[in-house]
């Protein structure tokens, strides 16, 4: 808190604003009849230096001139950039107890002259916007620095505006608030920025531009699209633009895409025909504008127009498969399955499927529509049947897909050979095979079909299948493949009117089963023991079981148990063993083996054969 300098004055030479590295002389003078009351000679003037209101130095030793009791001059050097406060105080040496009294103070600012402003850039947003220029001010001056932006153009007219930088605000941009209109399109303008502070001034190099150089058009607005005759592939994009626009850039993409289709349109006048759209697809459209074919800047992209193209009738053919099951001697159940068309083929929302089953010779036809991707009918076992399915949306139906209904596994000569299934990784299985050895007719295609080997899977879940061309002997199956689950895999070879198949089990990843089979009964028949069991629960199998092992040993024996290994068959749940001694009590148990190893043992059962066993 500096008093209003009642006791004296403080002056600075050469000035209170000095360049970095310069020294200054600060003189503190007492006014007449001020000072220590009785002994003027006891007046001692001291100078204190404050930075950010903190006392940093007593400049007692920096006196360069002293009129005892009246004035003192101090030299200050090595001042840091920014502002430093100096306070002169009077110390009356005869009264030690009294604190020094403030006389007066002064602020010295240390800075640098401004550098010439550089990289001037001016823009006007839209034909009706105003000119704003920005620049690089260069090094911080640490002083209040005024900047003047000056724009000169035709009609001998100059505009100018000012702003300043100090320790609180930075001035490197000014909006003149004046519009350059299209009637000045050919005119040249010169802009320069001048910087001035207490230590000097500097001016930028002149920067020359035209209306077309700096005006950035506003982005187009009111974007809409009109589909010609409700076409799903052709549309006219329309928009509003500023009057002077001569060039537009259009970009559009399906919403889930990562790359834009780009189109340049000259003199489009707010309209452009697009011919390569995908029907029934969500698109995003954006437009940018430019006022000049070669120079000038592109506008920002417009707001997006998001819309869906209309439907068109489906294209492509459905992938059909079927299952046949005999019901009795003269009836069979046909279950047809098909895969949904992909969006580019469906070209709209599929409303229903048209299904036809036809007996070729008697011309019997069964027809139906369904919203599902499967259809089941009971038909006679006699006759040659063919099926067809087509998909319909609001605009029409796809061409029907035909398939001949044959006995899929009826012809042994068409059965593929050496079918194998290898796990590739967690979610797929590589199936390979060799062609049928002695096929009567040419293989038209292979179908690889798979289904999880879990209870009820045949009735609950439709099959998964892949169509394979006749010259391919492998398929990588991945749809709905999960680790630690065993799948039944069938490879069908189909000719025009016959089918043969081979079956194998496979998994994509396996572990040893969680538990062994549960022995439910041991019975003695004709000098043989029959071991019966229940299969391991499906979730505990953890892959394809390759075989079961039956272990036995005499009770209380420490010898290694004997064992019998049985090839796994899903339908089998008992097995005979015949090497046990009569009237000896045995302990029996079972384990299960996958490619990953053997399960822990199942339950133990004791049994003592009675009859004469071999």
């Amino acid at each position: 808190n500096i008093d209003v300098c009642k006791l004296g004055t403080v002056t600075v030479q050469p000035a209170p604003v000095i360049p970095l590295g310069s020294a200054a002389n600060i003189s503190c003078s007492l006014n007449p009849k001020q000072g220590c009351s009785h002994y003027p000679s006891s007046n001692e003037l001291i100078l204190l230096k404050f930075v950010n209101d903190v006392l940093v130095e007593n400049l007692h030793g920096k006196k360069v001139h002293d009129h005892t009791g009246h004035s003192s001059t101090f030299q200050v050097t090595n001042l840091s950039l920014g502002m430093t406060l100096f306070v002169c105080k009077l110390n009356c040496s005869n009264s030690q107890k009294k604190p020094p009294v403030p006389v007066c103070g002064v602020e010295i600012s240390v800075g640098v002259a401004p550098e010439p402003p550089q990289n001037i850039s001016c823009v006007q947003e839209g034909e009706n916007g105003t000119v704003a220029c920005s620049w690089n001010s260069g090094k911080v001056t640490y002083l209040k620095t005024n900047y003047t932006l000056q724009l000169s153009g035709p009609n001998n007219l100059t505009c100018q505006k000012q702003c300043f930088s100090d320790n609180r605000q930075n001035c490197n941009r000014l909006d003149l608030g004046i519009n350059l209109s299209p009637d000045l399109a050919e005119s040249r303008f010169i802009v320069r920025v001048t910087a001035i502070n207490d230590l000097g001034n500097s001016s930028s190099l002149p920067h020359t531009f035209t209306f077309l150089d700096i005006v950035i058009p506003l982005p187009p607005w009111d974007i809409r699209i009109n589909f010609l005759n409700a076409s799903g592939s052709r549309g006219t994009l329309q928009w509003e633009d500023e009057g002077q626009v001569v060039l537009n850039q259009l970009r559009y993409q399906p919403l889930n895409s990562t790359s834009w289709n780009m189109v340049n349109a000259t003199n489009a006048k707010g309209k452009y025909d697009l011919r390569d759209l995908r029907p029934f697809t969500e698109y995003e459209f954006q437009i940018s504008s430019k006022l000049h074919l070669s120079g000038g800047s592109w506008s920002n992209w417009s707001e997006s127009l998001r819309t869906r193209t209309p439907e068109e009738e489906p294209v492509g053919i459905l992938d059909i498969w079927y299952m046949k099951q005999d019901i009795d001697y003269d009836r069979q159940q046909i279950s047809l399955f098909w895969k949904s068309l992909n969006p580019s083929e469906a070209r709209g929302k599929i409303l229903h499927y048209q299904v036809t089953l036809q007996e070729v010779t008697k011309k019997t036809t069964l027809q139906n529509t369904t919203r599902h991707t499967s259809w089941t009918r009971v038909i006679p076992r006699t006759g040659a049947w063919t099926a067809s399915v087509s998909a319909a949306n609001s605009k029409g139906a796809s061409a029907p897909t035909h398939i001949n209904i044959v006995d899929l596994c009826g012809t042994g000569l068409l059965a593929p050979h050496q079918v194998s299934a290898k796990s590739e990784n967690m979610d797929n299985i590589l199936v390979t095979w060799q062609p049928p050895k002695k096929a009567d007719s040419a293989v038209r295609e292979y179908i690889v079909e798979w289904r999880a080997l879990q209870p009820g899977s045949i009735t609950k879940f439709p099959p998964h299948w892949l169509r394979i061309p006749p010259d391919n002997m492998s398929a990588l199956i991945s749809e709905n493949i999960k680790p630690y689950i065993c799948y039944e895999i069938r490879v069908h070879a189909l000719s025009e009117s016959q089918g043969g198949c081979s079956s194998i089990r496979g998994d994509s990843k396996h572990k040893a089963p969680v538990s062994g089979p549960h022995i439910t009964a041991i019975t003695e028949k004709k000098e043989r023991l029959f071991i019966s069991w229940t299969h391991i629960p499906f979730p505990e199998q953890r892959g394809c079981i390759l075989h079961y092992r039956i272990y036995w040993k005499e009770r209380d024996s420490t010898a290694q148990p004997e064992l019998c290994e049985i090839q796994y068959r899903r339908s089998q749940n008992s097995h005979p063993i015949s090497s046990l001694q009569p009237r000896v009590t045995y302990v029996l148990w079972m384990t299960a083996v996958t490619a990953a190893g053997e399960s822990p043992q199942g339950n133990e059962r004791e049994f003592c054969p009675q009859g004469k066993a071999n």
């Epitope: 009706n128 153009g153 009609n155 007219l157 505009c159 100018q160 505006k161 000012q162 909006d175 003149l176 608030g177 004046i178 519009n179 350059l180 209109s181 009637d183 000045l184």
Partner: nanobody, 125 residues
Framework: QVQLQESGGGLVQAGGSLRLSCAAS????????MAWFRQAPGKEREFIAA???????LYIDSVKGRFTISRDNAKNTVALQMNSLKPEDTAVYYC???????????????????WGRGTQVTVSS
């Protein structure tokens, strides 16, 4: 409605200075750009300086560096400080208020809606 009244004109020797002032009545003064025009005998009215609502200033080249336009929105006044006057500056000086927007609009007297009656400035050699 804005009424404008100029003052400060007079006779001055070449090289001298004058300060013209223009008082505006009406609450909407700061909505307008303010300008000074002049008309020498037998000549058309000529734009010399303007100040926008956001304090951008515009000058014709013949007065740039000699004349300074300023405004005080609190007092509803606009001033024209004229230094280094020349005999060819002799004219009737008019204050005007309007809403020009583009660079081309500012020198056009048709873009100004309100005018003062003028004050005579005579520069003798």
């Amino acid at each position: 409605q804005v009424q404008l009244q100029e003052s400060g004109g007079g006779l001055v020797q070449a090289g001298g200075s004058l300060r013209l002032s223009c008082a505006a009545s009406g609450r909407t003064f700061n909505n307008y750009a303010m300008a000074w025009f002049r008309q020498a005998p037998g000549k058309e009215r000529e734009f010399i300086a303007a100040i926008t609502r956001s304090d951008t200033t515009l000058y014709i080249d013949s007065v740039k560096g000699r004349f300074t336009i300023s405004r005080d929105n609190a007092k509803n006044t606009v001033a024209l400080q004229m230094n280094s006057l020349k005999p060819e500056d002799t004219a009737v000086y008019y204050c005007a208020a309007g809403m020009p927007y583009s660079y081309s609009d500012y020198p056009r007297d048709s873009k100004y809606d309100y005018w003062g009656r003028g004050t005579q400035v005579t520069v003798s050699s």
